[in-house]
C-alpha cells in the first residue's frame, strides 16, 4: 500500500509541478517594472520569454512579441531552450508513469516493468525539474546583473541638461512559479524512484519450502533475507511460495499460478 | 455622447474648505481613471490628481498633496474632491478629465469646468 | 517634476500656411517596454476646455482633422498645423504622460497673421 501511495503520490505532485512550469513559461511576467525607489510611471512594464507587456494607468495593456530570433540574447535562448526540455521530458515522464501506476493494469505487464517504467519516470522528472529550477535561476540571475548595471547608471545623462530614466526590472511572478513548480516536479521524481524500489520483485536468497501439515494451509516464510533489488531483475526467478506473509501493496485479487504447490 | 459636468465651485476664503463634484454620463464610468486639472487664470494647464477605475491607485500633485482628497462613487457614476485649507494660489477653474483607455494616458474627455476662488 | 518647455510663446501665421510648435522635456518620454513616446497635444480654445489633439506624440484622436500631425521621440516633439483653418486660433498644450505628476507645457497661443 505504501509503495502505491508513493508511486500516486509521486505522480500527482509531478504533474501540478509540470503545470506549473508550463505556466511560467508561458507567463508574461518573468520581470517586471522595479516600482521602489524609482519615479511614478504611468505604465507599467514587464517581460516574459515570448513577449514584453506595458500595462497602462487605464488598465490598457499593449503587448508585443519578440519576432525575432537572432536578435535576441543568448541568456534568453538558453532559459526559453532549458524550460522547453523540462516541459518535453515532463510530458514524456507523465505518459510513462501513466502506463507505471500500480493501480492501473494493462495486460499482463510484470512488476519488474513497471519499477522500470517508473523508474524512468522518476528520473525525467528529476532533470524535468531540474531544468526548470536551471532556467529560472539563470534568468533570475540575469536579472540582478541587469539591475545592479541599472542602478550604478539610474540616470544617464543626454547632452548635458536632458536626462533619461532607465527602467529597472525585478523578480516577476513567474519566477517564483517556475522554482515551486520545478521543486515540486523534483520532489515528484524522486518519490517514483522511492516507489520504484518497493515496485521491484523481491528475490530471496534461497526457494522456501511449502510443508503441508494437516489443519495448516498457510507456510512460514522466513523475514530478514529481502535481496536487494534489481530494476532489470530476472522475472523468471520468482518464488515458489507466496502465502501468508504478503504486505499490502503484494496482495493480489485474483490466485497466482504460484499460490498451491 | 460623453459627459463631464463640474460642480461645487465657488468663493471660499483661505484655509476653507471646498468639495467639488464630476457628474459622468454616456460611458462605462467604473471603466475608467479620471484626472483633475486645473488652470489658473490667464496660467496654463496644472494637473492635480488622478484616480484609478476602482480607486485603487490614487495620485496628487505635490502642491495639493495633505490638502486635496480625491474619490469616487462608481454607483452614482460620480468624482469628488475634498479641497481644505485652500490657498490664493488655489483660485482657478477646476476641470475634470477622462483618462482615455488606449490614449497612452492622454485625457481624452474634459468637463466645462468649475472655477474656484479663493480670496479674503 | 518633468519640465515641459513649449516654444514659441505666441505664434502668428498667415492663413493657408504651415504652423510648427515645438516641445521639449526635460526627460525622455519614450518608455522602453513598448518604445512607444508618451506625450500628448491639446487645443484650448477661449473659453472652451481643452480637446484632445494628438496621444502617443504622432497618434491623431478621433474626429481631429488631418491637417493636424505630430512627430518626434525622446525628448524633441512638434505639432505641425499644415494649413491654418481660422477655426485654429487657439492655445495649444503639450503633456507628459509617462511620469507621475502629469506636467503641461506653458502652452503657445497661434493666432492669425
Known amino acids: 500500500m505504501a509503495v502505491t501511495a508513493c508511486q500516486g503520490l509521486g505522480f500527482v505532485v509531478s504533474l501540478i509541478g509540470i503545470a506549473g512550469i508550463i505556466a511560467a513559461t508561458c507567463m508574461d511576467q518573468w520581470s517586471t517594472q522595479d516600482l521602489y525607489n524609482n519615479p511614478v510611471t504611468a505604465v507599467f512594464n514587464y517581460q516574459g520569454l515570448w513577449r514584453s507587456c506595458v500595462r497602462e494607468s487605464s488598465g490598457f495593456t499593449e503587448c508585443r512579441g519578440y519576432f525575432t530570433l537572432l536578435g535576441l540574447p543568448a541568456m534568453l535562448q538558453a532559459v526559453r531552450a532549458l524550460m522547453i526540455v523540462g516541459i518535453v521530458l515532463g510530458a514524456i515522464g507523465l505518459l510513462v508513469s501513466i502506463f507505471a501506476l500500480k493501480c492501473i493494469r494493462i495486460g499482463s505487464m510484470e512488476d519488474s516493468a513497471k519499477a522500470n517504467m517508473t523508474l524512468t519516470s522518476g528520473i525525467m522528472f528529476i532533470v524535468s525539474g531540474l531544468c526548470a529550477i536551471a532556467g529560472v535561476s539563470v534568468f533570475a540571475n540575469m536579472l540582478v546583473t541587469n539591475f545592479w548595471m541599472s542602478t550604478a547608471n539610474m540616470y544617464t545623462g543626454m547632452g548635458g541638461m536632458v536626462q533619461t530614466v532607465q527602467t529597472r526590472y525585478t523578480f516577476g511572478a513567474a519566477l517564483f512559479v517556475g522554482w515551486v513548480a520545478g521543486g515540486l516536479t523534483l520532489i515528484g521524481g524522486v518519490m517514483m524512484c522511492i516507489a520504484c524500489r518497493g515496485l521491484a520483485p523481491e528475490e530471496t536468497n534461497y526457494k522456501a519450502v511449502s510443508y503441508h501439515a494437516s489443519g495448516h494451509s498457510v507456510a512460514y516464510k522466513p523475514g530478514g533475507f529481502k535481496a536487494s533489488t534489481g530494476f532489470g531483475s530476472n522475472t523468471k526467478n520468482k518464488k515458489i511460495y507466496d502465502g501468508g506473509a504478503r504486505t499490502e501493496d503484494e496482495v493480489q485479487s485474483y490466485p497466482s499460478k504460484h499460490d498451491y504447490v | 455622447e460623453v459627459q463631464l459636468v463640474e460642480s461645487g465651485g465657488g468663493l471660499v476664503q483661505p484655509g476653507g474648505s471646498l468639495r467639488l463634484s464630476c457628474a459622468a454620463s454616456?460611458?462605462?464610468?467604473?471603466?475608467?481613471?479620471i484626472h483633475w486639472v486645473r488652470q489658473a487664470p490667464g496660467k496654463g494647464l496644472e494637473w492635480v490628481a488622478y484616480?484609478?477605475?476602482?480607486?485603487?491607485?490614487?495620485y496628487y500633485a505635490d502642491t495639493v498633496k495633505g490638502r486635496f482628497t480625491m474619490s469616487r462613487d462608481n454607483a452614482k457614476n460620480s468624482l469628488y474632491l475634498q479641497m481644505t485649507s485652500l490657498r490664493a494660489e488655489d483660485t482657478a477653474v477646476y476641470y475634470c478629465?477622462?483618462?482615455?483607455?488606449?490614449?497612452?494616458?492622454?485625457?481624452?474627455?474634459w468637463g466645462q469646468g468649475t472655477t474656484v476662488t479663493v480670496s479674503s | 517634476d518633468i519640465v515641459m518647455t513649449q516654444s514659441p510663446d505666441s505664434l502668428a501665421v498667415s492663413l493657408g500656411e504651415r504652423a510648427t510648435i515645438s516641445c521639449k522635456s526635460s526627460?525622455?518620454?519614450?518608455?522602453?517596454?513598448?518604445?512607444?513616446?508618451?506625450l500628448a497635444w491639446y487645443q484650448q480654445k477661449p473659453g472652451q476646455p481643452p480637446k484632445l489633439l494628438i496621444y502617443?506624440?504622432?497618434t491623431r484622436a478621433s474626429g481631429v482633422p488631418d491637417r493636424f500631425s505630430g512627430s518626434g521621440s525622446g525628448t524633441d516633439f512638434t505639432l505641425t498645423i499644415s494649413s491654418l483653418q481660422a477655426e485654429d486660433v487657439a492655445i495649444y498644450h503639450c503633456?507628459?504622460?509617462?511620469?507621475?505628476?502629469?506636467?503641461f507645457g506653458q502652452g503657445t497661443k497661434l493666432e492669425i497673421k
Open positions: 478629465a477622462r483618462g482615455g483607455y488606449d490614449t497612452r494616458n492622454a485625457m481624452d474627455y
Open positions: 484616480i484609478s477605475r476602482g480607486s485603487s491607485t490614487i
Open positions: 502617443g506624440a504622432s
Open positions: 503633456q507628459n504622460d509617462l511620469y507621475y505628476p502629469l506636467t
Open positions: 454616456g460611458f462605462t464610468f467604473s471603466d475608467y481613471g
Open positions: 526627460q525622455s518620454l519614450l518608455n522602453s517596454g513598448n518604445q512607444k513616446n508618451y
